[in-house]
């Protein structure tokens, strides 16, 4: 639960955050797990700890291993683990899978590629961007803050993108690179006023008391990747997170699907252990984008369990 994988290349800077989060005032001690040796805090060391951060300036293959961070409040010590792997630099252009960060998708309307992990570093713009090891040049490519914007995206823009930047630590500069794949959805997109496919307006959903129930809010917003679109549930006009009922939760994240070429989003509302009082609540499926907001209301009714006779 409190273990995190991190990776980097030899002779580059690598900064790792302790997976165990605490309040800002808490101190953090780092140890190399295999030897239980404390990581120094003095910045003159190549590897040193700085609060929640562990810094390799620069990293070496021999640094690979599991590092323990202990977050200390005045009365409690809690432990996290960082599994660090430092790889040798590749002589050829191919970036192996184990060095790749999560893939991102884009389209003509939305082509941002964020540079992974950059928020951990002390860097200054501009970033350098490479595609398949070639420096990106031309007016279609714009390095903006911590991301790359590609104008007029085409299918040929798919590939592996590497961001390169300089981390500065007390006047010394260290190179950092990070690579992720970019895929392109090749479509001419447009945006519509949201259309809610489910639930139907004023739908009554039958549920069994004591059982779990799922409600799906599904809406379509147009064709292609949508710049601003969201579906969510409200209870009695209140956001789920503010309602404060831990049994009723929205599914983490929104599922994106393309139905008949349309861009649609789903949000599942999960009700654990349905109670009588749940039947009194108003469940609103909300779909919104730049055109506006549409709302469909659902209510729950008791479903009488069917008697089974042998």
């Amino acid at each position: 639960k409190f273990s995190k994988q991190s990776w980097g290349l030899e002779n580059e800077a690598l900064i790792v955050r302790c997976p165990r989060q605490g309040k800002p005032s808490y101190t953090v001690d780092w140890y190399y797990s295999q030897t239980n040796k404390s990581i120094p805090t003095q910045e003159r060391n190549r590897v040193f700890a700085s609060g929640q951060l562990l810094k390799f300036l620069p990293a070496a293959v021999a640094d690979s291993g599991i590092y323990t961070c202990i977050v200390r409040s005045p009365t409690f010590n809690r432990t996290g683990y960082a599994n660090v792997t430092i790889y040798k630099k590749q002589s050829d252009c191919n970036v192996p899978d184990y060095l790749m960060y999560s893939t991102v998708s884009g389209s003509e309307k939305n082509s941002k590629i964020y540079c992974p992990t950059i928020d951990l570093y002390n860097w200054t713009a501009p970033l350098e961007w490479f595609k398949n090891c070639q420096a990106l040049q031309g007016s279609r490519y714009r390095a903006h803050k911590s991301f790359l914007v590609i104008d007029n995206v085409m299918t040929e823009d798919a590939g592996d993108y590497t961001c390169k930047f300089i981390h500065n630590e007390n006047g010394a500069n260290y190179s950092v690179t990070a690579t992720r794949s970019f895929t392109v959805k090749d479509e001419q997109g447009f945006s519509l006023f949201p259309v809610i496919g489910a639930p139907a307006q004023n739908e009554i959903k039958e549920v069994e008391i004591g059982k779990n129930a799922n409600l799906t809010c599904s809406a379509c917003f147009g064709k292609g990747t949508q710049f601003l679109a969201a579906v969510l549930w409200q209870l009695n006009g209140t956001k789920i997170t503010d309602f404060g009922e831990p049994r009723i939760q929205q599914e983490e994240g929104q599922n994106q699907s393309f139905s008949n070429g349309l861009a649609c989003l789903d949000m599942v509302l999960r009700i654990a252990d349905v109670k009588e009082e749940d039947l009194l609540l108003q469940y609103d499926c909300l779909a919104l984008n730049l055109h506006g907001l549409r709302r469909h209301t659902v209510r729950l009714s008791r479903k009488n369990p069917i008697d089974h006779h042998s």
Epitope: K1, Q21, G22, K23, S73, T75, F76, R78, T79, T241, D242, G244, P246
Partner: antibody, heavy 123, light 107 residues
């Protein structure tokens, strides 16, 4: 020294209301999540409600949802529990307690507890 | 909600003996489990957090172990002041839940 002092308990008829208070001292009250836990006579511990620090998000046990309201006044270092529509089964010692760690979306243990205040619901 | 089941309900032992208390969760709580001690007329006192870490000021004779669904509180050698009721509590998710308690009494 961290101290939590509950007050406001007493005898109330079924259907009645009470407001419990918990005065906190010895720590920066506003940054800590606070919790109410109750214990019926001769029974075990039951979590009642939690409130986040400055964010103020609230959580309730099913048994009190819609009847009890947790709140806090950070300027007065005080935690409250407004109890309405009281029932005989709400009879218990009510403790306020501190969660010393929790970050957004997480919970932790209860490291400091008050001495408790007895609420008796009876006609 | 996550149900915590403690066993045994009562443990009758003599001072100096070893006490082993069990707490089983209905689903995994990772290591998000605590143990409390409660004496009559007093508020609970935190003993163990994160399944195995002793809280500040807790004697070394108290130790916790386990992860996932099965947890144990061990008192290596009972002192007279250790006779009390012990509760486990999970904090991986709301609602926070407690076990029903194990009473450690003098034999």
């Amino acid at each position: 020294e961290v101290q939590l002092l509950e007050s406001g308990g007493g005898l109330v008829q079924p259907g009645g209301s009470l407001r419990l208070s918990c005065a906190a001292s010895g720590f920066t009250f506003s940054i800590y999540d606070m919790i109410w836990v109750r214990q019926a006579p001769g029974k075990g511990l039951e979590w009642v409600s939690s409130i986040r620090g400055e964010g103020g998000g609230t959580y309730y046990a099913d048994s009190v949802k819609g009847r009890f309201t947790i709140s806090r006044d950070n300027s007065k270092n005080t935690l409250y529990l407004q109890m309405n529509s009281l029932r005989a089964e709400d009879t218990a010692v009510y403790y306020c307690a501190r969660d010393p760690w929790s970050t957004e979306g997480s919970f932790f243990v209860l490291d400091y507890w008050g001495q408790g205040t007895l609420v008796t619901v009876s006609s | 909600e996550i149900v915590l089941t403690q066993s045994p309900a009562t443990l009758s032992l003599s001072p100096g003996e070893r006490a082993t208390l069990s707490c089983r969760a209905s689903q995994s709580v990772d290591d998000d489990l605590a143990w409390y001690q409660q004496k009559p007329g007093q508020a609970p006192r935190l003993l163990i957090y994160d399944a195995s870490n002793r809280a500040t000021g807790i004697p070394a004779r108290f130790s916790g172990s386990g992860s996932g669904t099965d947890f144990t509180l061990t008192i290596s050698s009972l002192e007279p002041e250790d006779f009390a009721v012990y509760y486990c509590q999970q904090y991986i998710t709301a609602p926070l839940t407690f076990g029903q308690g194990t009473k450690v009494e003098i034999k």
